[in-house]
Interface confidence: low
């Protein structure tokens, strides 16, 4: 029996075309993705193939301004058309809370959502009830599959779950459930979740009747033979783990943003054991048209976008520097106010222990790309920001040692006067240079600020200690010479979109004046 | 109803710049590439370039790419093309045109200005 | 870039008859099921008016008189029972790949 698996993960709100690099589509007949392009893809494969599953790994939400305006509604009314039948949890389903998953997405899906490792408690424990799952039997032809759900237990210091949701460990989780399944006679097992290639795997080899693994968080292109675009193949694909019990089980995943649609077609044998499995992601290109319903669609809920864009969405009384000649040579504000949104987007229910798991940021100056007038009557507006974080990024979290942010800090000066992008700017850092020493040893002081303490104040960095750090994905990609952040970093959680969290934060302050306070100070 | 209504005549010398400008009502400025558009006198038309004033992304003739310049004011819905260098041969009429659809689907010019005629001479 | 051909040069017709004016691309400007050319007419002291889009579709406040066909290189614009107000300059323009290009013009005089 033949089963073709079509799976996506970590769309993050890009439900238009897209550029190859998945910012915004400028030249369509250049374009990717969206979904009247995949909707045209899925199509096809349901019509040519008897057995199709169409499943969406997680992190539907966040990315793009769609999400901003229409905050998982849009997830709720394309998946529903495009009809998906499962989609798992991913961290970013929580960033407006639990309220801003159960009302747009979990009460309108006509698809299961799926999570087993997620426990609700107190008064949410009923209010959330049957809207998510830990797993779904589904019919396909005439046999059943059984999918069942994990989400990352870092969640609740990469998003907002709140503190009734408890995420437990993926494969302590996900045993009890697979087991109940073997004991309703199904057979054939897809783990369908969102917690990244090196825990797809550990849950491919650990956990008892798992046919096959479909995964997202990582962002991990797979791909066997000439991978058609730009993305370099982290593994074949399938990647094929043995398990502890001795299985071959193929672990996929789709890279991002909707580029490609995975694409795996597994074949069992009448005891549900898997016989063989084989495919490639599809890149999702111009070659294939946008199917025009949904084209029709998407540009019917684009409008309310576009007035979106113009609306005011705060007020700032001072000039918000933002120009090439401060940020690249000096602390400025602009620096200051992306880094105190970024962190202030990364407040997290704490322990007593600490009052926040983060507390730094470092920002490439190269990537301000613009001030911000206060003279037009201070009114600071999504088009604004988008001329000032122009290039759709994110603000991601990583664990890197203190002698990497030390190295990071000596690379934000080593060619310093040349108006270059790689300056650092910084929140919860006091750094101090001095010029006249050679590159590589021009950090005279870099002190942080403290985590683990209930009134925060700035101590020395420690070289051995790991320390978490929001950034742009930029820099966690290595870019603007930041090799060192690339090859040492310890961790790695994508974030929310820049210009999402700038404008949050000037919604939720209303009135900003950020000042340039000596953050960063020449000896 | 949409609007393209663009700055009047211009007589420049050899050498001289040239900014024409083209004010659009009736629309959702920020949503729709604006196109620039030249015909020279008893000629055919000639793609100049383009801009999305929403992120200010443009696209360049190769042809022009040196002497051009095209840029929007989000306040004002106006949209500027700037042309260096000026030689005789660059008299013409220039059009601004906005492309219809909501994404960049087509690209089709579906309202056009009523043209600038650039007179260029010693 | 791609260069757009129009023939003829000049169509001279009576009210009534039937205009067929072909553009052909240097190379395909379709891709699966899309056809990125388009048709527009000019007349003198005027800007050009959008006939058709994608090869086939009537741009609304065209009459149903204009039509367009074709597909990959070869596209044709059809004026059916043509009348005295439709003598112009009719131009197609591709929008396939960058730079857009312009076919260079079809004159059409009616007698």
């Known amino acids: 029996w033949e089963l073709t698996i079509l799976h996506t993960n970590d769309v993050h709100s890009r439900l238009e075309q897209t550029s190859e690099d998945s910012s915004k589509c400028v030249n369509a007949s250049r374009c990717m993705g969206g979904v009247a392009r995949l909707f045209t893809k899925v199509q096809q494969i349901r019509r040519a193939e008897p057995n199709v599953l169409l499943l969406d790994a997680g992190d539907q939400y966040q990315g793009t301004i769609w999400f901003t305006v229409y905050k998982g509604a849009e997830v709720a009314h394309f998946m529903n058309a495009l009809r998906y039948d499962a989609m798992a949890l991913g961290n970013h389903e929580f960033d407006n809370g639990v309220e801003g998953l159960i009302e747009p997405l979990l009460k309108e899906a006509k698809f299961p959502i799926l999570s087993a490792n997620i426990k609700a408690k107190g008064p949410l424990a009923s209010q959330i009830s049957g809207l998510y799952l830990p797993y779904k039997v589904l019919p396909v032809g005439d046999e059943v599959v059984g999918i069942v759900g994990y989400t990352s237990k870092e969640t609740p210091f990469l998003s907002n779950p709140g503190t009734n949701l408890v995420f437990e460990d993926e494969i302590t989780a996900l045993q009890p459930e697979v087991d109940k399944l073997k004991t309703l006679n199904v057979n054939k097992i897809i783990a369908l979740g969102h917690s990244g290639f090196e825990t797809d795997k550990l849950i491919a080899q650990k956990v008892r009747g798992v046919d096959v693994v479909v995964g997202g968080h990582s962002n991990t292109f797979l791909y066997t033979g000439n991978p058609p675009s730009k993305e370099v193949p982290a593994g074949k694909y399938p990647f094929i783990v043995t398990s502890d019990d001795g299985r071959k089980v193929p672990v996929v995943q789709a890279y991002a943003f909707g580029k490609y649609l995975g694409y795996l077609k597994i074949e069992f044998d009448e005891r549900g054991n898997v016989i063989s499995s084989h495919g490639n992601p599809i890149l999702l290109n111009s070659s294939i048209p946008e199917d025009p319903s949904i084209k029709a669609d998407i540009n019917k809920w684009r409008i309310k976008l576009d007035n979106y864009s113009t609306q005011e969405l705060g007020k700032t009384i001072v000039y918000l520097d933002g120009s090439s000649q401060s940020c690249r040579f000096r602390e400025c504000n602009m620096g200051n106010l992306i880094c105190d949104a970024m962190i202030n987007n990364n407040l997290r229910h704490a322990d007593e222990m600490f009052w926040n798991h983060v507390s730094m940021c470092i920002l490439n100056g190269g990537g301000i790309r613009s001030p911000i007038d206060e003279r037009n009557n201070g009114t600071i507006t999504w088009e604004n920001l988008a001329a000032v974080l122009p290039f759709g990024g994110t603000f991601d979290l990583v664990q890197l040692k203190g002698s990497t942010l030390k190295k990071a800090f000596e690379h934000s000066v080593h060619r310093y006067g040349q108006s270059t992008g790689e300056f650092l700017q910084v929140g919860g850092i006091h750094v101090v240079y001095d010029l006249s020493r050679k590159p590589g040893d021009r950090v005279v002081k870099l002190d942080v600020l403290c985590t683990k303490c209930r009134v925060p104040s700035y101590d020395p960095l420690k070289m051995d200690e790991i320390y978490k750090v929001i950034l742009p994905n930029f820099l966690a990609n290595g870019g603007d010479g930041f090799q060192m952040i690339k090859d040492e970093l310890l961790r790695h959680d994508s974030g929310d979109q820049d210009i999402n969290v700038v404008s949050t934060y000037i919604s939720k302050m209303k009135v900003i004046y950020p000042a340039v306070e000596g953050r960063i100070k020449f000896s | 109803q949409v609007q393209l209504v663009q700055s009047g005549a211009e007589v420049e010398k050899p050498g001289a710049s040239v900014k024409v400008s083209c004010k659009a009502s009736?629309?959702?400025?920020?949503?729709?590439?604006i196109t620039w558009v030249r015909q020279a006198p008893g000629q055919g038309l000639e793609w100049m370039g383009d801009i999305y004033p929403g992120s200010g992304n443009t696209n360049y003739n190769e042809k022009f790419k040196t002497r051009v310049t095209i840029t929007a004011d989000k306040s004002t819905s106006t949209a500027y093309m700037e042309l260096s260098s000026l030689r005789s041969e660059d008299t013409a009429v220039y059009y601004c045109a906005k492309e219809g659809g909501l994404t960049t689907e087509d690209y089709a010019l579906d309202y056009w200005g009523q043209g600038t005629l650039v007179t260029v001479s010693s | 870039e791609i260069v757009l051909t129009q023939s003829p040069a000049t169509l001279s017709l009576s009210p009534g008859e039937r205009a067929t004016l072909s553009c052909r691309a240097s190379?395909?400007?379709?891709?699966?099921?899309?056809?990125?050319m388009h048709w527009y007419q000019q007349k003198p002291g005027q800007a050009p008016r959008l006939l058709i889009y994608?090869?086939?579709n009537l741009e609304s406040g065209i009459p149903p008189r204009f039509s367009g066909s074709g597909y990959g290189t070869d596209f044709t614009l059809t004026i059916n029972n043509i009348e005295s107000e439709d003598a112009a300059y009719y131009f197609c323009?591709?929008?396939?790949?960058?730079?857009?290009?312009f076919g260079q013009g079809t004159k059409v005089e009616i007698k």
């Open positions: 190379k395909n400007v379709s891709t699966s099921g899309y056809s990125y």
């Open positions: 009736g629309y959702t400025f920020t949503s729709y590439w």
């Open positions: 994608l090869a086939s």
């Open positions: 323009q591709h929008s396939r790949e960058l730079p857009f290009t």
